[in-house]
Amino acid sequence: EEELQVIQPDKSVSVAAGESAILHCTVTSLIPVGPIQWFRGAGPARELIYNQKEGHFPRVTTVSESTKRENMDFSISISNITPADAGTYYCVKFRKGSPDTEFKSGAGTELSVRAKPSAPVVSGPAARATPQHTVSFTCESHGFSPRDITLKWFKNGNELSDFQTNVDPVGESVSYSIHSTAKVVLTREDVHSQVICEVAHVTLQGDPLRGTANLSETIRVPPTLEVTQQPVRAENQVNVTCQVRKFYPQRLQLTWLENGNVSRTETASTVTENKDGTYNWMSWLLVNVSAHRDDVKLTCQVEHDGQPAVSKSHDLKVSAHPKEQGSNTAAENTGSNERNIY
């Protein structure tokens, strides 16, 4: 009679994480008598997965009634597969004895686990940056298998090309992680912009995962200032306005100075929003000209988002009122510790 063969018909089986894997195994003879065992891996470090004779294997069930005397099908089903279950499984026939001895092994079935990548997480720079700067964004996704994966970056609808991607580990593993860093150039119109990391994988059936970062959390757009003198409202009163334009974020404090002395300080509250997401704000100062003997230097000083103050001045010619006169000059305090800030 022909010697018993252990047949594992599938060289490989691929299963999605969470599903069950069926590993097929048949023998060609009932002789010699003895149990079947399933192992993952080969050699002395192999891991017992199922023993027909004894033991408790809660995730493993036999496909056919392996207890019947004439049964020659020893296929098993492993439930709730995770990436940690990946490996080569061997169906091994033992000869009955004290102890049982290994008689013949199947060729092995490689089980690969298809695991979905985690939702990509996109993170930007630690501190706000200003337009015209190039900043880095990172995207991470974990726990996927197999290793092949595609990652793309977009700024709004436009695909980015300046990025570097690594998949770890380099060698064989039960699951993998991807890490990518993209360089993004900020513009003054980027408050509403988004940076998107898109991950495509065989497990996602053509429906990629996306992670998003809003550039509103990254960008700081400094304001421009304009000081203008309005027509005289009353005989001795002049209205001077300071227009603060195109700034983001909203956090802004404005101080009026008359000849270097603080007149009023206010915080931007009722701002108007521009289409690009930046803000405009206007403050006005009513100056009683009759209270001044000499020309008045009016300064609108703005501190935006905790940055050093930027200011713009207007020379109010007392002798010339009620005409609109005066020249605009601008000043800025660079705010290092050594400076005198108003």
Epitope: P125, T130, T224, S311, T329, E332, T334, S336
Partner: antibody
């Protein structure tokens, strides 16, 4: 006292690279940008680019793209500029400077590093 | 790139003179103008930022003015120690750009 200490003069061969350093003292390194400026008799002062050690953001003059690479090491409060594929055109004095982040003037300057490219 | 044009590359003045150095930008730079003084063999020194704000330690005989595209540095009462090259610089749009410099000499 705010100080920017630049590395010493360099004499380098054409085709080689050089890495200039700028150590920041007397202020919080990550709160300000470090800018680099080139000075030559022919072109005067030219802005090369800047790096913000806090955000990691950089801005560059396209003229120096591929020529100058800016980096910063927060642990040592030091900024670096590497100049590659050097030619005689790169012979100059290079300054590192400091500026508040975003549309502020360069308020402190290093003493300058002289780079001479010669065979 | 924004061009910064200093109309005169050199200027000769007498002690006590009031002199002005003009700088014209090729487009509006929203007051983001700085003036630097550079003495031979030294690094430039910031005198004025934001068009008119004097840096700490800069003497009040220096002043700045202007808006839009046109900016001016004034020295009121020229002193011997003012002999230097003066540069304007815009920092509104990258690349930041400098004027060609005005070399100031005493007659």
């Amino acid at each position: 006292e705010v100080q920017l200490q630049e590395s010493g003069a360099e004499l380098v061969r054409p085709g080689a690279s050089v890495k200039l350093s700028c150590k920041a003292l007397g202020y919080t390194f990550t709160d300000y940008e470090i800018h680099w400026v080139k000075e030559t008799p022919v072109y005067g002062l030219e802005w090369i680019g800047d790096i913000h050690p806090g955000s990691g953001g950089t801005a560059n003059n396209q003229k120096f793209k591929g020529k100058a690479t800016l980096t910063a090491d927060k642990s040592s409060n030091t900024a670096y500029m590497e100049l590659s594929s050097l030619t005689s055109e790169d012979s100059a004095v290079y300054y590192c400077t400091r500026a508040v982040s975003g549309y502020y003037a360069m308020d402190y300057w290093g003493q300058g590093t002289s780079v001479t490219v010669s065979s | 790139d924004i061009q910064m044009t200093q109309s005169s590359s050199s200027f000769s003045g007498s002690l006590g003179d009031r002199l002005t150095i003009n700088c014209k930008a090729s487009e509006d730079i929203y007051d983001r103008v700085a003036w630097y003084q550079q003495k031979p063999g030294n690094a430039p020194r910031l005198l004025i930022s934001g068009t008119a704000s004097l840096e700490t330690g800069v003497l009040s005989r220096f002043s700045g003015s202007g808006s839009g595209k046109d900016y001016t540095l004034s020295i009121n009462g020229l002193q011997a120690e003012d002999v230097a090259t003066y540069y304007c610089q815009q920092y509104w749009t990258t690349p930041w750009t400098f004027g060609g410099g005005t070399k100031l000499e005493i007659k």
